[in-house]
């Protein structure tokens, strides 16, 4: 039997307002509203918390019966829909201990785990997975790309008691591995030996000058020489013009700086590699994954352009149940959501085309009127008379 610690689908109208608490840390936090957005698969089932004000911080949270994930799997799952074509904003959740003062939740409030998508400018389109380990927020060393389209997506984090993890988007694995390998929770296993230093006679030169090579005697020639073909101009007056000097040209026999040929260095020892030793600071921690207390799920975000919808929150200890729940919620409505969006896009295209056609028609009409105004006035005669008068149309 799976343990379901928290589940929120917003299926009871305004009932969510009694379960979710707004932070009062700042007076100008943005407001969440219940909405299924501009397009959806099922208007009722797809209702979720939507950010509604641009360029705002948001801080909202819901509490649940506190639990510890020691000795068991932890699964955190929710859906996010950036229907506003987001430019910069968070779509992540934070799991806090139950000691959090929900009315004072803010960006620096200490959390246990932060997970979910974050988009900001062209440089950030990633899924954050951050663990608070011994009081420090430790970021994952891998880059997990998030979805940046306008549709609803399902995000799942699985943390197992064997210190492994998995991240899924739309019920498909996008990343997995070991907590110790993919985060810097622990000091490195090996460090450079602080007592070792490169011996003074260590030769890192692969090539050296050939000591037997010597410069040829005829090597040194000047770079520039007087032009042998130059002649003093006939009108040159040494009293007036000074002593005539021929112009200088590049010496064809100039060989440049002589360098001895290079040979393999018989004393070459290669690049000195600093020897490593076991790090005395390192000790394994089999309980990296474990937290004594989870009690609050919070949305602590900044959004430049609002419109993101959060729905189908689930915290459980059962991976299969979470996958099933995802398929029964996001999985059921995703196709219809895309259909509705495609239909809206098609209607918009048609409307745009119609507007363009109307504009073109108006422009043609205006042009005709202008032409009539511009052309010279003609006498009002019948066609027959005009023809008899010999008029011809230009």
């Amino acid at each position: 039997e799976p343990a379901v610690y928290f589940k929120e689908q917003f299926l009871d109208g305004d009932g969510w307002t009694s379960r979710w608490i707004e932070s009062k840390h700042k007076s100008d936090f943005g407001k969440f509203v219940l909405s299924s957005g501009k397009f959806y698969g099922d208007e009722e089932k797809d209702k979720g918390l939507q950010t509604s004000q641009d360029a705002r911080f948001y801080a909202l949270s819901a509490s649940f019966e506190p639990f510890s994930n020691k000795g068991q799997t932890l699964v955190v799952q929710f859906t996010v829909k950036h229907e506003q074509n987001i430019d910069c904003g968070g779509g992540y959740v934070k799991l806090f201990p139950n000691s959090l003062d929900q009315t004072d939740m803010h960006g620096d409030s200490e959390y246990n785990i932060m997970f979910g998508p974050d988009i900001c400018g062209p440089g950030t389109k990633k899924v954050h997975v951050i663990f608070n380990y011994k009081g420090k927020n430790v970021l994952i060393n891998k880059d997990i790309r998030c979805k940046d389209d306008e549709f609803t997506h399902l995000y799942t984090l699985i943390v197992r008691p064997d210190n492994t993890y998995e991240v899924k988007i739309d019920n498909s694995q996008v990343e997995s591995g070991s907590l110790e390998d993919d985060w810097d929770f622990l000091p490195p296993k090996k460090i450079k030996d602080p007592d070792a230093s490169k011996p003074e006679d260590w030769d890192e030169r692969a090539k050296i000058d050939d000591p037997t090579d010597s410069k040829p005697e005829d090597w040194d020639k000047p770079e520039h020489i007087p032009d042998p073909d130059a002649k003093k101009p006939e009108d040159w007056d040494e009293e007036m013009d000074g002593e005539w000097e021929p112009p200088v040209i590049q010496n064809p026999e100039y060989k440049g700086e002589w360098k001895p040929r290079q040979i393999d260095n018989p004393d070459y020892k290669g690049t000195w590699i600093h020897p490593e030793i076991d790090n005395p600071e390192y000790s394994p921690d089999p309980s990296i994954y474990a937290y004594d207390n989870f009690g609050v799920l919070g949305l602590d975000l900044w959004q430049v352009k609002s419109g993101t919808i959060f729905d189908n929150f689930l915290i459980t200890n059962d991976e299969a149940y979470a996958e099933e729940f995802g398929n029964e919620t996001w999985g059921v409505t995703k196709a219809a959501e895309k259909q509705m969006k495609d239909k809206q896009d098609e209607e918009q295209r048609t409307r745009r085309m119609m507007r363009t056609k109307m504009r073109m028609r108006r422009m043609r009409r205006t042009r005709r009127k202008m032409r009539r105004k511009m052309s010279p006035a003609r006498p009002r005669t019948s066609c027959r008379e005009a023809c008899l008068q010999g008029w011809t149309e230009a």
Epitope: A55, C88, G107, D108, C120, P122, G123, T124, K126, Q303
Partner: antibody, heavy 127, light 106 residues
Framework: EVQLVQSGAEVKKPGSSVKVSCKAS????????ISWVRQAPGQGLEWMGG????????NYAQKFQGRVTITADESTSTAYMELSSLRSEDTAVYYC????????????????????WGQGTTVTVSS | SYELTQPPSVSVAPGKTARITCGGN??????VHWYQQKPGQAPVLVIY???KRPSGIPERFSGSNSGNTATLTISGTQAMDEADYYC?????????FGGGTKLTVL
């Protein structure tokens, strides 16, 4: 990689204001946060505040609150720092520095340090 | 307000290991960055997030952070490493720098 070029040296009278500019090139301006750091002669580094151009909001060190204004113009990829009510203690080299923006939260870029710095602008306050 | 404390100066013989410390209350819970500054020049980031090296920074620079002390280690110190070094962290919604340490290579 982004490069930051700052405006030239300034000599100011006590009580006046100074506005230093920092133009970014070679990168997407909206992908960075810009901090302003000053260094008085023979002293250490002191953070004054910063701005994330894509947010449009600035964050200031308590010490400079009310006296410093940091702005950014995305169209010209330029950040500005204006310091008012100048006194002789404000004589310093003023640096702008950028941090890669790796997320939408204010604190995100501070996880990555300031990896590109301007050449510095010397501001001398003297009567 | 949060404070970071560095020794004013550290001396090291060429080829030896230099260690510069940065003390702060529970600094191990924060992300610490280190900057190198040579006379008349702008600072250069040499370590970020406690122990990560930006591209172009030699391998001899490393960092660690736990408890109340963060440490910048320069192994096989060279004459060119002589400079001022500053630690930096994010504390109480503000950026905080240490007072700086002058590293002298003997």
């Amino acid at each position: 990689e982004v490069q930051l070029v700052q405006s030239g040296a300034e000599v100011k009278k006590p009580g006046s204001s100074v506005k230093v500019s920092c133009k970014a090139s070679g990168g997407t301006f909206s992908s960075y946060a810009i901090s302003w750091v000053r260094q008085a002669p023979g002293q250490g580094l002191e953070w004054m505040g910063g701005i994330i151009p894509i947010f449009g909001t600035a964050n200031y060190a308590q010490k400079f609150q009310g006296r410093v204004t940091i702005t950014a113009d995305e169209s010209t990829s330029t950040a500005y720092m204006e310091l008012s009510s100048l006194r002789s203690e404000d004589t310093a080299v003023y640096y702008c520095a950028s941090s890669p923006l790796r997320g939408s939260g204010w604190y995100w870029h501070y996880y990555y340090g300031m990896d590109v710095w301007g050449q510095g602008t010397t501001v001398t306050v003297s009567s | 307000s949060y404070e970071l404390t560095q020794p004013p100066s550290v001396s090291v013989a060429p080829g030896k290991t230099a260690r510069i410390t940065c003390g702060g209350n529970k600094i191990g819970t924060k992300s610490v960055h280190w900057y190198q500054q040579k006379p008349g020049q702008a600072p250069v980031l040499v370590i970020y997030q406690d122990s990560k090296r930006p591209s172009g920074i030699p391998e001899r620079f490393s960092g660690s952070n736990s408890g109340n002390t963060a440490t910048l280690t320069i192994s096989g110190t060279q004459a060119m490493d002589e400079a001022d070094y500053y630690c930096q962290a994010w504390g109480s919604s503000t950026v905080v720098f240490g007072g700086g340490t002058k590293l002298t290579v003997l």
